[in-house]
Each structure stands twice: as C-alpha cells, then as structure tokens.
C-alpha cells in the first residue's frame, strides 16, 4: 500500500492522543534505552510503511503484536485516514486470523515495540530544524 | 548486532577500477540511508557519497562526481561504490556508514552517522 | 561550497573543561553532529542533533549550536578522550565535515 495520499495530521493526532500511551503501556518496565535503533523512516508514507510492516507483520520471536491495543487503534487510524487502505488489508486480516496465537509478551516483542516508537516518533516530528 | 563490514579494497593502477562492497547486519537495512566516507592518510574524514533507504536519491562530493557511482542492493544487506578512473588523491580508507535522514517534498537532508564499519584500504599507484 | 572550520588543536588538563568549536555561515539553521576518532578505530558519533547524546556516550560530553557555531564541550576531561574530534552537518545536498580537531590531555 501507497500511504502517500494519508492525512498525516490526522495520523498524528491519533497517535498523540491514544496509539503512544498505548506503546507506553506495552513497553512499563523497560528503559527506552535498552535497546539500539534497527529500523528507520525518512518521511511520513515510509514511516508508515514500516510501521505498517512491524505492527502487522509476524517477525521471529514476535508473533502476536496485531492484538495489541495500539496495534488495533494503528490499524483504525489508517483505515479512516489511508484511501483504500482497508480494502487491501481485506486478505491480510483473513490470513492472521488462521494463525492467531496465545498472546505472548518476548523480549523480542518489547523489542520491536521500541522500534515501533522510534518510528512514531519521527512521523510525528520530522526531522526538519526549521519547519 | 548492528555491524556494516567493508571490503573489495586493495591496491589498484592510476585510471583503473575497483569496486568496494559494504554489507549490513543486524538493522533493518532497507530503511537506511548510507553514506561513504574516506580518510587519507593522516588526513580527516572526507564525504564521499550517500544513497537513500530505497536508493531513489544519490549524492556525490564535487571530487568524485562523474567518476564514482554508489548504489545498493537491498534483498542483499549491501552498498556498493564502484570507483572508475581513479587517481592517487583516491588512496585512503573508505568507510561505509548508516545515516539518519529525512526528506520532505522539496529536499532530502541527511544527518548524522551513527554506525560505521571498520574500513577498507584503497592504494591508487603506479 | 560550505566549509565548516574547528582549531587544528585544544589541549586540556585531566578534570577540566574542554570546548571544541566548529564554525560555518549560518550553522545554527543546520543540526550539527560531533565524531571522535582514536588512532587506529573508525569515527564514533558522540553528539547528535546538535545537543544529543547517542546511548552508551559519557554524560560529560554535551553540544550546543547557535548563529555561525557548534560547540563540543567534555566536562571533566578524562585522558581516554584523547582523540580526533570531527563536526559535521548537511548543506545543498552535501555532508561536510570540519577538518578536525586534535585534543590532547595534557
């Protein structure tokens, strides 16, 4: 999916609101300095394409973040302010459900979900010194 | 862990080519952009060229435009820098390096390099 | 083309302060970022964003950056920060890094 064509503003008003307390949430108890930075975005469509790719894809170790409240909210954020973005999703649901696991909490899990911050918040604040 | 390992240095004619490789582990590779950067001998560290994550943007220094070309494979973990007509002023170490970066719809800029490899010799001579 | 511009040399006492500076045409508009390099060992970013410290770099290494200057300051100066120190920032499409800055713990 292009998410070129997303209302960013409104992207970032969801994760300022909910999606980043929820991140908090999930991450209680860990230093935000335990682990390096592995994955990176370099404006606003790929931050989403990676956080798309983290959130929802199964990695080793990790299976079971698509479940997550802030995975849930990522996901409805991008169905309303993505066009078209739900219909291609429409499969990728269908195929999770068939391999829907026990929720478990790995460290790879908390890992990838301070990866998935990083990328929050370089979507939320570009990198630009003078906006 | 996150490590980027050069090669394909070595000691190469004046006006001939060489071609360094750089390959990455342990970070998510295509969503980096990465730089080279070269040290001459008891010199300071000079930019040479950066390509973004998806390879769509290059740039070069002034020094190697037109002769150095930087590209990446990423189903491979890999940058390139294929170096055609080189010169003694080319001989140095090259660095291969991961860089923050960010662009808009105008530019690209490119920050700092947090990770770096270990460096691979070029000796241009005759 | 832009040029950024630090002290060949700054020497300094083991304990004190040292202050590196790097200066360029309307810096402070750019993030300015700060490598150290020991004899041997590839460059290690110690300052990002002007004033960030990557994990894992000592708490005595800060930077600022403000109208044509960048400043490394190491407080407390210890003798393995004896190094090379480099300044670097983006301009038109180019990276550009100071010419870099030999500190000596004396």
């Known amino acids: 999916y292009d998410f070129t064509n997303c209302d960013f503003e409104k992207i970032k008003a969801a994760y300022l609101s909910t999606i980043s307390k929820d991140l908090i949430t999930y991450m209680s108890g860990t230093k935000s300095t335990e682990f390096n930075n592995t994955v990176s975005c370099s404006n606003r469509p790929h931050c989403l394409t990676e956080i798309q790719s983290l959130t929802f894809n199964p990695t080793a170790g990790c299976a079971s973040l698509a479940k997550e409240m802030f995975a849930m909210k990522t996901k409805a954020a991008l169905a309303i302010w993505c066009p078209g973005y739900s219909e291609t999703q429409i499969n990728a649901t269908q195929a999770m459900k068939k391999r829907r696991k026990r929720k478990v909490t790995t460290n790879k899990c908390l890992e990838q979900v301070s990866q998935l911050q990083g990328l929050w918040r370089r979507f939320n604040r570009p990198l630009l010194k003078q906006q | 862990q996150v490590q980027l390992v050069e090669s394909g240095g070595g000691v190469v004619q004046p006006g001939r080519s060489l071609r360094l490789s750089c390959a990455a582990s342990?970070?998510?590779?295509?969503?980096?952009?990465i730089h080279w950067v070269r040290q001459a001998p008891g010199k300071g560290l000079e930019w040479v060229a950066v390509?973004?994550?998806?390879?769509?943007?290059?740039y070069y220094a002034d020094s190697v435009k037109g002769r150095f070309t930087i590209s990446r494979d990423n189903s491979k973990n890999t940058l390139y820098l294929q170096m055609n007509s080189l010169r003694a002023e080319d001989t140095a170490v090259y660095y291969c390096?991961?860089?923050?970066?960010?662009?808009?719809?105008?530019?690209?800029?490119?920050?700092?390099?947090?990770?770096w490899g270990q460096g691979t010799t070029v000796t241009v001579s005759s | 083309s832009y040029e950024l511009t630090q002290p060949p040399s700054v020497s300094v006492s083991p304990g004190q302060t040292a202050s590196i500076t790097c200066s360029g045409d309307?810096?402070?508009?750019?993030?300015a970022c700060w490598y150290q390099q020991k004899p041997g060992q590839s460059p290690v970013l110690v300052i990002y964003?002007?004033?960030k410290r990557p994990s894992g770099i000592p708490e005595r290494f800060s930077g600022s950056n403000s109208g044509n200057t960048a400043t490394l300051t190491i407080s407390g100066t210890q003798a393995m920060d004896e190094a090379d120190y480099y300044c670097?920032?983006?301009?038109?499409?180019?990276?550009?890094f100071g010419g870099g800055t030999k500190l000596t713990v004396l």
């Open positions: 390096a991961r860089g923050d970066s960010w662009n808009d719809r105008l530019n690209y800029y490119f920050y700092d390099m947090d990770v």
């Open positions: 342990g970070f998510t590779f295509s969503s980096y952009g």
């Open positions: 390509i973004s994550y998806d390879g769509s943007n290059k």
């Open positions: 309307k810096l402070g508009d750019k993030y």
């Open positions: 964003q002007d004033n």
């Open positions: 670097q920032a983006w301009d038109s499409s180019t990276v550009v």
